[in-house]
Structures are given as C-alpha cells and as structure tokens.
C-alpha cells in the first residue's frame, strides 16, 4: 500500500516529487538557503525517509528552521551592536563591531558582519573571525616645542609608554602594542631564564607610588647578537607580558619607527628620554623625569669614545648618540632600557628611535654622550619575535 503523500515543510522542498510513494520509495527534504533541517530541535545534515511495507514512513517529517549564528564573539577592547534587532542572531541578521574610541583602532575590516546561511558571522570580505581592536600608539599629553629642557618632571599622560622594571635593579622599558615591552638586553640579562621574577609596572608617575598597573612577564627575548659584559652591541630585548594591558591615557604603547622615521632623527633633531634613573643628586628620581636632547653626529660620538678609558670601536652602527657637548643633560643608571622618543611630524605620533643603553662613567659628562640602541635597525627582529610568539 502507498505511504501518505509527503508535504514539504515551510521553507523546504522534497525530492523526488512522485504521484505516489510505495514500498521502498524514498524522498529527501532540502531546506532553502538560510534554513536548516531539524528533527525536533536537533540539527540534521540530511534527511531521507523510506516507505515501509505497512504503509508508513520510517521517520517523521523534519522542519526547516532558520539558521541561527548564535551570539557573536566578544571583541576585546570593543563592543558589538545588534543592528537588525536586540539579540537577533538568525540568518541575514547584521551586527556592527566597534572599538573603544581614542585608544583603539579597528584592523582587518569595517566591523560589519552578517549571519550567513552556513551559520557563521561573516564580514563583507568573507572573514569569519571578529575584527581586532589594536591599541593606538604614540599618543601623549605632551607637545614638543623643540627646545632643550633639563631634568623636567613628567606629568600624567606625558610618557604613557613608560614601563618601570624592577628585578635585580631598577630599569625601564617601553610598551609596544598591549602585551610587549621593549627594553635593553643588559637591563634584564640576569632575569633571562626567570622571566616571572620581573616586576613590571605601567602607568606609574612616582617610582614608589602604589598607583600603577601591575604586569608580569611570560617570556624574555634577548637579541642573539648581544654578548653580556662584552660591549653593548645589539643591546635590545623584548618582554612578552602574560596578559594584555588595558590602554588608557596613562598607559599607551609607543610606535615603532616607520621606514621614513630617519628623517626625524637626523643630527640635532630632538629626542626625549625619560626615566627614574639617577639625578644630579646621585639618587634615583622619585618622579618620572624627562630630558629633551639632540642627536649627535655619529662620527663625533665615535671619536668621543675612542679615548681612554673607553676602547675603540665601542660605538657601532647599531647605536645612536644623543646629548649636549657641554653635558648636563643625559640618561643615567636606572634609566636603562627606556625609550628615546621622537615626534613623527607627519603622523603626529611619538615613536621609539633609541633605547637607553650606555654612556660615560659620569652621566651628563661634557664631551661625552648618551649611547642608545638604534631601534630602526631591529624592526625585522622585533616584528619576527612578536609575530611568532
């Protein structure tokens, strides 16, 4: 005897269509795009029913239910807005991702995603992953006047990339992105196998203040060309933080130099060094201090360090020098690893040109200069570490 004539569910169709269905005949149900087969509430990949000899189908008719993409992924440092309607996550629904203004910018796409027939939230470019909110780098409350200042006290937001590193001794670093710190290899060399011992503080102004954001190191990467106690060539290191930090006006990453950055780092261009290192009184500074200092001609600097007690060849092509011939304005012990920053006049963002590395026996000595790791030489190294880890 024939089985009851099957009726396709709403938003579905059956195949093959026959005048009647008898023993061993079968039909399949296919749903329209944006709808999925459900048996009860359970999704089916496919459905086929067979007519049995008692004249009944071997299984009940499924339904074609609208595809539900489910709640979209949260966006760290951003938010998601339902455009179609509150909490609507079904086929053709639209959502809009956006990043927290001022401190983050959206990478990858425009943030608009649609619930597609395959059940995935998809951007106009076909991406299924949510966009990324990247921290905006190089923002500072400070504007440069190009003048030379000596030992000025920093104000909140002036150097939001400044990182205080406490381990064996006091050192500094600069925040990159939201989970990396750029510093000098010599400053953290002793802790290279014990990253967790580094006490990393962000958003601090006073060295001893309890008001700061605590961070801890997950891993330390020291440049493979750096040799401890054998000069300061390749004096550069990266610290990966075990958590991303929240970016705000007091904690903002420094930019890495663009290819064009050297045009803002010529001889006599002004850079700014900041830190809690030794001051003229011979004590570590309580308040974050900064000094605006000019870049010194490389040959002039090399010559300055060829006289005893310095050995010839101390200043390499991987270094840049800054300071005054008359002395008095310099980085010092405790400032190691901190950034020498420059303003990119085109983007109006600050970038790191140098890392406080070494200098004369007596800081700020006349005729001697502060020596900094030349960051632009290490962009491939930095990017390689960050992308791989």
């Amino acid at each position: 005897q024939p089985c009851p004539y099957p009726m396709a569910p709403p938003n579905g169709h059956l195949s093959p269509v026959q005048a009647k269905y008898i023993l061993k005949d079968s039909f399949s149900i296919f749903c329209e795009p944006g709808y999925e087969l459900l048996q009860g509430h359970l999704p089916l990949k496919s459905f086929a029913a067979v007519c049995q000899k008692d004249g009944s189908w071997d299984q009940p008719m499924p339904s074609c239910s609208i595809v539900d993409c489910g709640p979209p992924d949260d966006l760290p440092s951003g938010r998601v807005e339902y455009i179609t309607g509150p909490e609507v996550t079904t086929y053709k629904a639209v959502i809009q991702y956006s990043c927290e203004e001022t401190f983050y910018t959206m990478k990858v796409n425009d943030g608009k995603y649609v619930c597609e027939a395959d059940g995935f939230w998809t951007s106009s470019k076909g991406e299924r992953s949510p966009p990324v909110c990247e921290p905006v780098c190089g923002l500072s409350a400070r504007t440069t006047g190009g003048q030379i200042y000596g030992g000025q006290k920093a104000k909140p937001g002036d150097f939001p990339w400044q990182v205080l590193i406490l381990g064996g001794s006091t050192a500094a670093g600069a925040l990159l992105y939201d989970n990396w710190v750029l510093t000098a290899a010599h400053a953290i060399y002793e802790q290279k196998h014990d990253a967790s011992s580094l006490d990393i503080r962000l958003g601090a102004l006073k060295r001893l203040s309890p008001h700061y954001t605590q961070a801890w190191a997950e891993a330390v990467f020291i440049h493979e060309g750096y040799t401890h106690d054998a000069g300061f060539d390749n004096d550069i290191a990266l610290i990966k933080l075990n958590n991303k930090v929240v970016i705000n006006s007091n904690i903002t990453p420094i930019c890495l130099p663009r290819k064009e950055a050297e045009s803002f780092m010529r001889t006599d261009d002004i850079g700014t060094a900041s830190g809690w290192g030794l001051t003229q009184r011979g004590l570590l500074a309580r308040n974050l201090m900064y000094v605006d200092i000019p870049i010194v001609d490389h040959q002039k600097c090399t010559a300055a360090y060829e006289k005893p007690p310095y050995s010839g060849g101390s200043v390499t092509a991987n270094m840049l020098c800054a300071g005054l011939e008359s002395g008095g304005k310099d980085a010092c012990r405790g400032d190691s690893g901190g950034a020498l920053v420059f303003l990119d006049n085109e983007t109006q963002r600050w970038f790191v040109g140098g890392i406080v590395s070494w200098g004369s026996m007596n800081c700020g000595e006349a005729g001697q200069y502060g020596v900094y790791t030349k960051v632009i030489n290490y962009i491939p190294w930095i990017k390689n570490i960050i992308s791989n880890f």
């Epitope: 459900l38 359970l42 999704p43 089916l44 990949k45 539900d68 059940g119």
Partner: antibody
Framework: QVQLQESGPGLVKPSETLSLTCTVS??????????WGWIRQPPGKGLEWIGS???????YYNPSLKSRVTISVDTSKNQFSLKLSSVTAADTAVYYC??????????WGQGTMVTVSS | SYELMQPPSMSVSPGQTASITCSGD??????AYWYQQKPGQSPVLVIY???KRPSGIPERFSGSNSGNTATLTISGTQAMDEADYYC?????????FGGGTKLTVLG
Amino acid sequence: QVQLQESGPGLVKPSETLSLTCTVSGGSISSSSYYWGWIRQPPGKGLEWIGSIYYSGSTYYNPSLKSRVTISVDTSKNQFSLKLSSVTAADTAVYYCARDRRGRFDPWGQGTMVTVSS
Amino acid sequence: SYELMQPPSMSVSPGQTASITCSGDKLGDIYAYWYQQKPGQSPVLVIYQDNKRPSGIPERFSGSNSGNTATLTISGTQAMDEADYYCQAWESSTGVFGGGTKLTVLG
C-alpha cells in the same frame, strides 16, 4: 549571561529515588530556543546523557535509563528537575544540568556530587 | 546502541598541533560536538556542528567530520589546553558521548 545551578541531596540510599533540581538564572526557562538537559559523570569516568526537556514538558530520555528517569519543568520557578528511581552504587556520579541549544550543551552547571550508599 | 570511540590519551608539545579523533559508524552523516573538561571543572563546549566555534573559544580550536571519523584539531597547543576532551553526537534523538581523551601538553 545564563547560569545553571544544581541542588539536591549528596547522599542517597540504594533502591531509593535520587532527586535533583536545576535553577536557571539570567534567562527564562520558557525560551522557545532551548531544551534543558541532564548529564552525569561517574568518578574518573566519561560523560553520559540522561535526558532533556522543553519548557512545554516535552521530554526525551537515554533509552538505557528511560525506565527509571523522570525529568520535569517548573516554569514559575525557572527550574527543571531530575528523578532517578531504584538507584544503585553505579548511579554514583557528578550530575550536571545544561542548556541544550539545537543539540549543543552550553552552558553547564557546576555539577553536584551524588553518592549512593547505605 | 550507538558508540563513539576515542583514544584514551595523547600528548603534544607546546606550539604543536594536537588532533583528537572520534570514530563511530557513519559519524560523518551526523553532526559531531566537542567538549573540553579541565580537572575539577564542568565541561565547556568548544566545537559544535562539526566545525563551528562558540563565542569565546580561541581560533586555534577547529573541527572536521567525514566518513566514520570526527577530528578536533588544536593548532599551536598551549599549556592551558591540557584537559579531557569528549566528542558527542545525536543518533536517533539519543545523546551519545565518547569515552574522552586526556590531552597532556608536555614540558
């Protein structure tokens, strides 16, 4: 954010009935999008699905437990319950409740340990 | 009754790819689901309908299902991924779980 919390006695005597309740917070049990399920896990062993219920009272059970299981729902209290009769030591397990959305269990309750012992 | 089989244990080095398999008769014809369970915690859904990731699950988790085998792949495995993993499927409206695979991340 929906949360589920199991409650009930931690010790049940053999041959008696195990009774547990799952309280749903942060969402309505009467949502048409979800079933609500019970899953258990004997100590050191894997997961076993017990059964699921819709807010209307429609149920489906694991055939191996069907003769002993009753799952019910109380929409006024935003709760659903499990009863397992004639228990033995083999029913000793952590019992979880979970939201069942189109066949996927998410989220789960924290679980409650039930020991069957005299 | 329908059965899903998983290897009881497997190990992987950090940063490497872990592939956990789940086999069952014509499993590829139905949807597979994967759950992660860390010691003393409730299970967490990591993959549903073969290859879909719930909100909040890292992109390193992916899934596939064809023939008689479903696979959960964890690329760039991290120490935090050490856990028990269970596959699950629905056969004739009955929920079935695999026996679970204990994933150890070495080092």
